[in-house]
């Protein structure tokens, strides 16, 4: 598991100190008050597929 202060979670996810895990930022849609959602607000979601430019 990732420790705080080491490499960040991959794009589209954010570190949860409560759970000690990288959590999918998609969770913040329904549960915006989760501890990791603050980190999600600063980063754009991961694109699932390439969009036409």
């Amino acid at each position: 598991e990732q420790a705080p202060g080491t490499a960040p979670c991959s794009r589209g996810s954010s570190w949860s100190a409560d759970l000690d895990k990288c959590m999918d930022c998609a969770s913040c849609r329904a549960r915006p008050h989760s501890d990791f959602c603050l980190g999600c607000a600063a980063a754009p979601p991961a694109p699932f597929r390439l969009l036409w430019p």
Partner: antibody, heavy 125, light 113 residues
């Protein structure tokens, strides 16, 4: 292994307040969301609401703000209060944990994986 | 609210045969940023709490027999039991947790023919 044990009054009169508590044993309390669900006799499931250890809640608007979900982190417990009950609130009430699962190192909520035993609540005059 | 509709309401299948239960959501529960459908399937036997079978529409919960599988995306989902066993007699519910309030289908009662 996480276990949920729930308790509360089983027989209420109309206009009284339903009060149920669910205790979490054998696992982490922090970070998870803890839910209440009910099931009227012979009918389907209805989600009431959820809370995390920080006290952040989501509730079902169908209850018209009659419900209060609270948490006591010192005891690893969470509770449901439902005011002004009527016969329509007669149901089996369950507490449950919203589980977390991972894929490629990224975790997400993944459904209610641990449930309490259920408490039958009857509202009758 | 996202309305979930299951079909059929009840189903009778012979032992060893395939059982298929459908679930339709009134709006998409596919989250485009991670291509994940926020849909679960539960099994409930009389006098017991529901048991989680499938999450993210198609991922089997740990300990669930591999005869249970989930499929579908967007608004249309299916739970399949490939070879019905006597212990599979139960009511099955789908549930969306894409947005609050999280909502369940009305349930499908599965019996042995």
């Amino acid at each position: 292994q996480v276990q949920l044990q729930q308790w509360g009054a089983g027989l209420l009169k109309p206009s009284e307040t339903l009060s149920l508590t669910c205790a979490v044993y054998g696992g982490s309390f922090s970070g998870y969301y803890w839910s209440w669900i009910r099931q009227p006799p012979g009918k389907g499931l209805e989600w009431i609401g959820e809370i995390n250890h920080r006290g952040s809640t989501n509730s079902n608007p169908s209850l018209k703000s009659r419900d209060t979900i609270s948490v006591d982190t010192s005891k690893n417990q969470f509770s449901l209060r439902l005011r002004s009950v009527t016969a329509a609130d007669t149901a089996v009430y369950y507490c449950a944990r919203e589980g977390i699962s991972g894929s490629m190192g990224i975790y997400d909520y993944s459904g209610m994986d641990v449930w309490g035993q259920g408490t039958t609540v009857t509202v009758s005059s | 609210d996202i309305v979930m509709t299951q079909s059929p309401d009840s189903l009778a299948v012979s032992l060893g045969e395939r059982a298929t239960i459908n679930c339709k959501s009134r709006q998409s529960i596919l989250y485009s940023s991670n291509n994940k459908n926020y849909l679960t399937w539960y099994q409930q036997k009389p006098g017991q709490p529901p048991k989680l079978l499938i999450y993210w529409a198609s991922t089997r919960e740990s300990g669930v027999p591999d005869r249970f599988s989930g499929s579908g995306s967007g608004t249309d989902f299916t739970l399949t039991i490939s070879s019905l066993q006597a212990e599979d007699v139960a009511v099955y519910y789908c549930q969306q947790y894409y947005s609050t309030p999280y909502t369940f289908g009305q349930g499908t009662k599965l019996e042995i023919k």
